[in-house]
């Protein structure tokens, strides 16, 4: 039963996006009074795992020696102290890449784009998928989702950028995912370098600008669209 104890902190090392077969360690940090740590995985019998605390008792380690589909998912942890169980931690979403072969990422009309013009990043999969994700390296909001509705799977998703500013320049990759689990992603596409040229350096848009004034990917999500009109792909980001 959840008590007044502060919630623990949950994180993964080296990160929460792990390639198939690689190791990952999940850490749960509570307080020095903790006697036991419990890790729960959504849609799995609870507890998923229990661990005794490591000295000085304020955290526990949950080891995954080789990442597989079974480990991908949403986790929360708790700790038990003499007065009872803590509140749950904020969730940790452990994502596995390598579940599917890589999609193809291209830029239309070209990866060389003049500031102020438009460009569309196109992520294509040779088999039907229902989620496409566009990731920009070193971006504050790296995950741009395009998810299909009603199970209507697609071979591609378009991520338009207009008008382009210098902030859009950089290295992009995309992933695709199947309806089995949104915690299972494809291998990453080969990287695409988007090069923005222009006689004047565009000022960095402020995070308060609306999407219609073309804030860059570091500031707020792009507005993706389906590969064809009424394609059943739904805009979604996080």
């Amino acid at each position: 039963q959840a008590g007044p104890l502060p919630k623990p902190t949950l994180w993964a090392e080296p990160g929460s996006v792990i390639s198939w077969g690689n190791s990952v360690t999940i850490w749960c940090q509570g307080t020095l009074e903790a006697r036991e740590y419990r890790l729960d995985k959504e849609e799995s019998p609870a507890p998923w795992d229990r661990q005794n605390p490591l000295e000085p008792k304020n955290k526990a380690r949950f080891s995954i020696p080789s990442m597989t589909e079974d480990y991908a998912g949403r986790y929360r942890c708790y700790y038990r102290s003499p007065v009872g169980w803590s509140q749950p931690s904020d969730p940790l979403e452990l994502v596995m890449t390598g579940a599917y072969s890589k999609p193809t990422l291209s830029a239309l009309p070209s990866p060389l784009v003049t500031s102020g013009k438009s460009v569309t990043l196109l992520c294509q999969s040779r088999s039907p998928m229902d989620t496409f994700l566009l990731i920009k390296e070193r971006a504050a909001h790296p995950l741009l989702h395009l998810r299909s509705e009603h199970g209507a799977q697609q071979h591609q998703a378009e991520f338009p950028m207009s008008p382009v500013t210098s902030v859009h320049g950089g290295t992009y990759r995309c992933f695709s995912s199947h309806g089995f689990s949104h915690y299972l992603l494809s291998h990453p596409s080969d990287p695409l370098e988007l090069i923005v040229s222009g006689s004047l350096e565009d000022p960095r848009p402020s995070p308060t600008r609306s999407v219609s004034t073309a804030a860059g990917p570091e500031d707020q999500p792009l507005m993706p669209t389906g590969s064809v009109p009424h394609s059943g792909l739904r805009r979604h980001w996080e």
Epitope: Y100, S101, Q124, R126, S127, H155, S186
Partner: antibody, heavy 120, light 110 residues
Framework: EVQLVESGGGLVQPGGSLRLSCAAS?????????ISWVRQAPGKGLEWIGS?????????YYATWVKGRFTISRDNSKNTLYLQMNSLRAEDTAVYYC???????????WGQGTLVTVLE | DIQMTQSPSTLSASVGDRVTITCRAS??????LAWYQQKPGKAPKLLIY???TLASGVPSRFSGSGSGTEFTLTISSLQPDDFATYYC????????????FGGGTKVEIK
Amino acid sequence: EVQLVESGGGLVQPGGSLRLSCAASGFSLSSSYWISWVRQAPGKGLEWIGSIDSGSVGITYYATWVKGRFTISRDNSKNTLYLQMNSLRAEDTAVYYCARHGDNWALDLWGQGTLVTVLE
Amino acid sequence: DIQMTQSPSTLSASVGDRVTITCRASQSISSWLAWYQQKPGKAPKLLIYKASTLASGVPSRFSGSGSGTEFTLTISSLQPDDFATYYCQHGYIRGDLDNVFGGGTKVEIK
């Protein structure tokens, strides 16, 4: 050397079963590829049977005409792909190829083929 | 379903001729089209991918064009080694397909 080598073909009676193998060398079947089985009946064109994704989930798709008679699987530890064929018919007589889909979505690597003959 | 229709099914030509083979998809396949050459008793050999890109080691007399639903393979000057059967193939993989290949075009000596 990067190659695919099929084996397991031979003579089989109608209604019988056969398992073909496709051994990959020079690259890993668990890297980011699709692998397809393709067949060619004597004097006929190329016919796609089905494909398996090399990702860890191993999604498979089959041609509509397969109707559950054939199953594609793989063993990553042996770097080998399989085609299990059941309820074989005379019209399944063909050379069976495995082929790799490259980054360009084309079949850039083919095996030499193995002949399956379904004969009374 | 995506149907691939190749024409002609047979083509008689002479050495030095310019030869054109057409492949039509029943719906748009973007540029995901490949062309293969096959000789009797041999596995197919990739000639062109992504509609117009020449595969490694393929002579420059071969060229491909088209996008969407209409595609063409051209041999600018037919050589003795080019008498073979040619197939087109789309790059999509899914469960509603009868085949990913066209029916083939046999290029024979006139």
